[in-house]
Interface confidence: low
Amino acid sequence: EMGTADLGPSSVPTPTNVTIESYNMNPIVYWEYQIMPQVPVFTVEVKNYGVKNSEWIDACINISHHYCNISDHVGDPSNSLWVRVKARVGQKESAYAKSEEFAVCRDGKIGPPKLDIRKEEKQIMIDIFHPSVFVNGDEQEVDYDPETTCYIRVYNVYVRMNGSEIQYKILTQKEDDCDEIQCQLAIPVSSLNSQYCVSAEGVLHVWGVTTEKSKEVCITIFNSSIKG
């Protein structure tokens, strides 16, 4: 087996393909590395844009796997961050490999809102529950929040009735329609036998990124009776 003494001064390869993926505001860094005779360890550092005296902060130190969860090191999810990764084999270190610029709110994915549908008197009530995300280990809803610039500012609600589709918009800042848990939409029911199918997606401030679209939920009205 080759020892570190056999490695030349710049012969520790640099990690490649440093990428960041984020789902529900939980960003994880991935990278690739060639097979080495000795097990390499990796250090991952994060730099946040917009932080005073912004410096590279250690996120994962001397790890042997090829991923690192950096969610504890993200400031404002609307702001950009960069990641760099270096490898160490024995006492020798590689150069840093840098990621592209990444903003959790702009470049990440957020799961769909959850929907509930029911009939109340002469209307159908649709409950749209905000997607849950994890911020610094805490579960939070992506509802309107004056403390952050990353929140759902509008829901696009798609209502299909007997084949034709209507799109509604709900502004999350309207307190009549929304609270910290959910938004509500009321749709008048026609007197005809009808099937209503509803799906929804959130649109995030600042850049209008959409969440994943919810699964369609349906309700059928038969002569003022309900069949779910």
Partner: nanobody, 122 residues
């Protein structure tokens, strides 16, 4: 890559006018609010004024009556019209995309224009 690109600026005499523009590389229709900031030499960056998605504007006292912010959603562009310029308006001007809180305060995001220098001097 989303970018805010600024145009305009330059040297103008006291009492003169200048218009700055900020072009966004995507639709600004869904952006809650946009703002102009300025940074005088050796000073920190300060808010000049804001415009919300429905066109509502707000200005700091030093800009009221002289500066006007407008937006053209079709062109994805925000403008800062500056009239009756004074030497103390000399600064680098920046545009920003952000949000307005329920209390009416502006919250900048990390998305800034590159800055454009305005010099007011005779």
């Amino acid at each position: 890559q989303v970018q805010l690109q600024q145009f305009g600026g330059g040297l103008v005499q006291p009492g003169g006018s200048l218009r700055l523009s900020c072009a966004v590389s995507r639709s600004i229709f869904s952006i809650d609010a946009m703002a102009w900031y300025r940074q005088a030499p050796g000073k920190q960056r300060n808010l000049v004024g804001t415009i919300t998605s429905d066109g509502t504007t707000n200005y700091v006292d030093s800009a009221k009556g002289r500066f006007t912010i407008s937006r053209d959603n079709a062109k994805n562009t925000v403008y800062l019209q500056m009239n009756s310029l004074k030497p103390e308006d000399t600064a680098v001007y920046f545009c920003n995309a952000g949000a307005v809180s329920r209390t009416g305060g502006y919250r900048p995001s990390g998305y800034w224009g590159q800055g454009t220098l305005v010099t007011v001097s005779s």
